[in-house]
Amino acid sequence: ATKLTEEKYELKEGQTLDVKCDYTLEKFASSQKAWQIIRDGEMPKTLACTERPSKNSHPVQVGRIILEDYHDHGLLRVRMVNLQVEDSGLYQCVIYQPPKEPHMLFDRIALVVTKGFSGTPGSNENSTQNVYKIPPTTTKALCPLYTSPRTVTQAPPKSTADVSTPDSEINLTNVTDIIREQKLISEEDLEQKLISEEDLHHHHHH
């Protein structure tokens, strides 16, 4: 089996985590995709998911999490806006393939959110002053309760992020985007031990 690794991201309160999950294969384009948190010793908890079938370029918002699936480029964009210290924890993207287990990504995100230089949003000189407005036309999708027992791992302490109720609009200042990419292994390639060099030797773009 392929070892799941973690990458650590340190952000300040009020900033934005912007993740690209690279699912690559066309057969996954319309599949429902989810963003999960893995709490210490527990099963992964789905915080947000796309619709089923997943719609192209159609934002789905659950609280401060926005998912957007770009079928034509094989990318799921996950944004967690206005980060709070309580959002610290271990996260992953998965693709639902019922009745099979979800397809997991290689790298999980160990997110650490710390207090900013001051309690006032926008006071950080190093941050941009963009205001993100999430349009109220975004959709909240119903997520399956199904999680894979294989994904239970030891997560960092303080993995207590909960998702607030959906907001119709989010104004966000003090934004720093962290762009990263992740890889999926296709089930067939695993079976045939044909894991691509791209997947084995991928590079991360921050």
Epitope: K20, T24, L25, E26, K27, A29, S30, Y70, H71, D72, H73, G74, L75, R77, I179, E181, S186, E188, D189, Q192, L194, S196, E197, E198, H203, H205
Partner: antibody, heavy 121, light 111 residues
Framework: EVQLVESGGGLVQPGGSLKLSCAAS????????MHWVRQASGKGLEWVGR??????????YYAASVKGRFTISRDDSKNTAYLQMNSLKTEDTAVYYC????????????WGQGTLVTVSS | DIVLTQSPDSLAVSLGERATINCRAS??????????LHWYQQKPGQPPKLLIY???NLESGVPDRFSGSGSGTDFTLTISSLQAEDVAVYYC?????????FGQGTKLEIK
Amino acid sequence: EVQLVESGGGLVQPGGSLKLSCAASGFTFSTYAMHWVRQASGKGLEWVGRIRTKSSNYATYYAASVKGRFTISRDDSKNTAYLQMNSLKTEDTAVYYCTRDMGIRRQFAYWGQGTLVTVSS
Amino acid sequence: DIVLTQSPDSLAVSLGERATINCRASESVDTFDYSFLHWYQQKPGQPPKLLIYRASNLESGVPDRFSGSGSGTDFTLTISSLQAEDVAVYYCQQSNEDPYTFGQGTKLEIK
């Protein structure tokens, strides 16, 4: 090991037709889009077109220079991609390569050795 | 269509010296800061070989003297220390939108 083997090339008169085949092995053929790329002698590479997978309804895309004359198809049960070339012109003379990408809009990691198509009277 | 223009058309560099090839796109080949621009090497009588994918990622098995950089419309392939076996034609290619396109190629020779 991934292998792509082209066949079907040869000499054909202008206005004629030819069908190229690309036999694939070493990977799950149905999972990936397949492309054709050509190269005239001493010239650069030209992307001819691609065919996507069943989950994308086998959608096809072509370069403007071949649109309406060339047709790409695939038979997943035979692990084979095809390039049907009609109304051939002398400028279609080239080595034709079959390539496999690494996924949606990803790079061409695997290439066949190519098959030569000569259009001449 | 996105036009890729490589420069120079040909290049002669001494063994052990740095070789730089540029590729300019007529419009951005990025989606979310994710550049769908790749580099290939082709030697006479052989099919092209992938060197760099998505602007800066080294393909497995390719010597680390090869590197790629750039985003948006401007990209560079660099060979840090030219070796005799690097003599070839180099192509950039974009897959951000259909139709996919290649640059016209840059011929690299030993000075």
